[in-house]
Interface confidence: medium
């Protein structure tokens, strides 16, 4: 099945090529799915059918579902599907997963960051970038073309990166933007079998019971950009999401980087509230890589009233 | 978040091949990489193959080089893992991971696994 994902923001320009490919004198039809009806090539419509191309001039949420397009040819049909979503503007900062388009790598010796989908539109130069949503400012980022360069990269380049742009039809102007992420290949930087530098093997905990506790799992990795590189809990061989115990919860800390370059991470268990039951289980801080999984192991204690005195 | 299914996981001879399928839905899958785990009856879960999905770079363990090929599709959002002149130490629960780097806030997460059983 010719299917491709689309997705775009309400009251942006969002265009649509049709998954299955045919010469420019093949006539393409393209009808809603859902009602089969037909979707009109007349520019005056808000969403409307070119060749290849489906436009949204601009998209609303409504618009969102399943489109058909039939590339016809004297001898053959080819049927393609374009999924497409559209959804609401942000408030805040954050870029969500399902925003995203591909992740894309680059070194100090090459990073350029192409505009996705841009080649749809009909846009002029310059394009604006963003990075994290702030503005990028300073020699070192050039928009050029379609893409953006980044003069001597750094690990903290990486980031979320936005492009910008205006697509122009018929003399209207309409506002397109498209995220990716942009990772860091550090060209000295090395992977070794995950060090957990906390908890310590077989670590017993000493817990009030009623109150609430953190334990802290932290594990280094190599130095620059890691692959595959994660820390998580486990209670009793499971994973925290699938234990089902709403009390314990795990949280992603601060990702690291030392003073000797080590690439670390944390994650943090909270259980609140703990109880008798919390003490018969076994907690596992887990960090793997490609190398492959360590494992150090942590038991609740109930906290001797004693030590309240000392 | 994003699920992982995996499949492609059986029963056959030494010497023969088996090709695992992970297929990803619910979240982005073009992020930094994709890789296969497995985890041997009373032994650690170890690394296997991994793919970078947005550059191909590759990474296999000693044990399964020459023998396993890892690639990924991302029009199809799935990753798969040939396996190739299969031994009885491959047997194994494998399991697909996906994640991000630490400069990268995607999460890491697993699928449920396959069992592959090398045995005549």
């Known amino acids: 099945k010719f299917s491709k994902q689309s997705w775009g923001l309400e009251n942006e320009a969002l265009i649509v090529r049709c998954p299955r490919q045919g010469k420019p004198s093949y006539t393409v039809d393209w009808y809603y799915s859902q009602t089969n009806k037909s979707i009109p090539t007349q520019e005056r419509n808000r969403v409307f059918a070119s060749g290849q191309l489906l436009k949204f001039l601009p998209a609303a949420v409504a618009d969102s579902g399943i489109y058909t397009c039939i590339v016809r040819s004297p001898t053959f049909n080819r049927t393609g599907y374009a999924n497409v979503t559209i959804y609401k503007k942000q408030s805040d900062c954050n870029v969500p997963d399902y925003l995203m388009y591909s992740t894309v790598s680059g070194s100090e010796k090459n990073s350029k960051i192409y505009c996705p989908t841009i080649d749809l539109y009909n846009w002029t130069a310059p394009l604006e970038w963003f990075k994290n949503c702030q503005a990028l400012q300073g020699s070192r980022y050039r928009a050029h073309k379609s893409f953006l360069v980044i003069d001597n990269v750094m690990t903290e380049d990486a980031g979320d990166y936005t492009c910008k742009f205006i697509h122009n039809e018929n003399g209207a102007n309409y506002s397109v933007t498209a995220t990716r992420s942009f990772t860091v290949k550090d060209e000295q930087g090395f992977s070794l079998f995950p060090v957990i530098g906390a908890p310590a093997q077989n670590e017993i905990k000493e817990v009030e019971i009623g109150k609430n506790a953190n334990l802290t799992c932290s594990a280094c990795f190599g130095k620059g950009t890691q692959f595959l590189a994660a820390v998580l809990w486990q209670l009793n061989g499971t994973k925290i999401t699938d234990f089902g115990e709403p009390r314990i919860q795990q949280e992603e800390g601060q990702n690291q980087s030392f003073s000797n370059g080590l690439a670390c991470l944390d994650m943090v268990l909270r259980i609140a509230d703990v109880k008798e039951e919390d003490l018969l289980l076994q907690y596992d801080c887990l960090a793997l890589n490609l190398h492959g999984l360590r494992r150090h192991t942590v038991r609740l204690s109930r906290k001797n009233p004693i030590d309240h005195h000392s | 978040e994003v699920q992982l299914v995996e499949s492609g996981g059986g029963l056959v001879q030494p010497g023969g091949s088996l090709r695992l399928s992970c297929a990803a839905s619910g979240g982005t899958f073009s992020v930094y990489a994709m890789g296969w785990f497995r985890q041997a009856p009373g032994k650690e879960r170890e690394a296997v193959a991994s793919?970078?999905?947005?550059?191909?770079?590759?990474y296999y363990a000693d044990s399964v080089k020459g023998r396993f090929t890892i690639s990924a599709d991302n029009s199809k959002n799935t990753a798969y893992l040939q396996m190739n002149s299969l031994k009885p130490e491959d047997t194994a629960v494998y399991y697909c991971?996906?994640?991000?780097?630490?400069?990268?806030?995607?999460?890491?997460?697993w699928g449920q696994g396959t069992l592959v059983t090398v045995s005549s």
């Open positions: 793919i970078s999905t947005s550059g191909g770079s590759t």
């Open positions: 991971a996906i994640g991000g780097t630490l400069y990268d806030r995607r999460r890491f997460e």
